[in-house]
């Protein structure tokens, strides 16, 4: 039940990307929504051999990936702040999962180029806006209220049934002819049924 509701809420989430509002904004699709998460694409020029890429949320470092080469041209890839990431020959993708309203913010790709020189830092970014559709909002608002109301009705129903059962039981205990009267009623009913059949 819990997982079902969770998937429902994930389905309700929508992602809107507003780029071009800040200096150094990405001139490509920076955010790709899939599988209940977001892929944040940080591009770098093909010529770049060694670099550090940091994903910033506002001013906070969320993730980083550093690619360097040794004197034998062996590649080393390191992450100090680990996120699920993917490296290609011209981009680093960082993946964020379990999105909620707190993820809505400016995201920046902070690229430090070590090689080829000169050392250079570039910052590109965009705003990741997370909102929910009206239908989902309404459902999410009324669903708990409906559930609560259902629970209250069930509790009241149980109380009522218990009370009626208790009342009936107590009245039958106080009436000495109660059992006889009940038997007589059953016999009368049997008789009339037989009469109906013969006619």
């Amino acid at each position: 039940m819990k997982s079902g509701l969770w998937y429902f809420f994930l389905f309700c989430l929508r992602i809107k990307v507003l780029t071009g509002e800040i200096n150094g904004s990405a001139n490509y699709e920076m955010f790709i929504f899939h599988n209940g998460g977001v892929q944040i694409l940080c591009k770098y020029p093909d010529i770049v051999q060694q670099f550090k890429m940091q994903l910033l949320k506002g001013g906070q470092i969320l993730c980083d990936l550093t690619k360097t080469k040794g004197s034998g041209n062996t590649v080393s890839i390191k992450s100090l702040k680990f996120c699920h990431s993917q490296l290609s020959n011209n981009s680093v993708s960082f993946f964020l999962y379990n999105l909620d309203h707190s993820h809505a913010n400016y995201y920046f790709c902070n690229l430090s180029i070590f090689d080829p020189p000169p050392f250079k830092v570039t910052l590109t970014g965009g705003y990741l806006h997370i909102y929910e559709s009206q239908l989902c909002c309404q459902l999410k608002f009324w669903l708990p209220i409906g559930c609560a109301a259902f629970v209250v009705v069930c509790i009241l129903g149980c109380i009522l049934i218990c009370w009626l059962t208790k009342k009936k039981y107590s009245s039958s205990v106080h009436d000495p002819n109660g059992e006889y009267m009940f038997m007589r009623a059953v016999n009368t009913a049997k008789k009339s049924r037989l009469t109906d059949v013969t006619l």
């Epitope: 051999q49 080469k69 040794g70 034998g72 041209n73 080393s76």
Partner: antibody, heavy 117, light 111 residues
């Protein structure tokens, strides 16, 4: 200012062991690959070994593979070279070098290792 | 392993004259748009010093009389106007793959 200071060199008998150290300062040690390069008296430069920033990748020259071990302690900003089964041909000045992304951009003054009986 | 050779072994040049050192590799050092070749200068009693990287890019603080050229397997270091402080041994070095190797060196003296 980048500084690399080697120590631990000396005279050792063939088959013996030595541990060289290189104290680094003036830069973020844990951001760089580091290497050892040696130079026999009156001869040319020979690359010995390297190690990546975290110490997880190491490479060796065929001349020393299996006998030498490179390591680093980023907390102490120190590079090491453990040399076992030393031979006469290992006699050289051993330089600690910083691999500055595209070349050996900083060198220590070197420490002399003499292997002789 | 890639073998690096240098020529000449030594040369003597007059002050202010041009000095040219050649370096040849046993296989191409070109990868993408980069030649993985560096040049070092070693003065007597001193550790080596990085001069040129990627075959033709001068390192920080290196005088512009030093220049590097070449691609693939053939490279050249040129000192356009030799100064007294340029007396040294010059080494070419590749970092195309492991193990990186140095050339045997070329000794430059003043005539």
């Amino acid at each position: 200012e980048v500084q690399l200071v080697e120590s631990g060199g000396g005279l050792v008998q063939p088959g013996g062991s030595l541990r060289l150290s290189c104290a680094a300062s003036g830069f973020t040690f844990s951001d760089y690959w580091m290497d050892w390069v040696r130079q026999a008296p009156g001869k040319g430069l020979v690359w010995v070994s390297n190690i990546d920033e975290s110490g997880s990748i190491t490479e060796y020259s065929p001349f020393v593979k299996g006998r030498f071990t490179i390591s680093r302690d980023n907390a102490k900003n120190t590079l090491y070279l453990q040399m076992n089964s030393l031979r006469a041909e290992d006699t050289a000045v051993y330089y600690c070098t910083r691999w500055g992304r595209f070349g050996f951009d900083s060198w220590g003054q070197g420490t002399l290792v003499t292997v002789s009986s | 392993d890639i073998v690096m050779t240098q020529s000449p072994d030594s040369l003597a040049v007059s002050l202010g004259e041009r000095a040219t050192i050649n370096c040849k590799s046993s296989q191409s050092l070109l990868s993408g748009s980069f030649n993985y070749l560096t040049w070092y200068q070693q003065k007597p009693g001193q550790p080596p010093k990085l001069l040129i990287f990627y075959a033709s890019t001068r390192h920080t603080g290196v005088p512009d009389r030093f220049s590097g050229s070449g691609s693939g397997t053939d490279f050249t270091l040129t000192i356009s106007s030799l100064q007294a402080e340029d007396v040294a041994v010059y080494y070419c070095h590749h970092h195309y793959n492991a193990p990186p190797t140095f050339g045997p060196g070329t000794k430059v003296d003043i005539k």
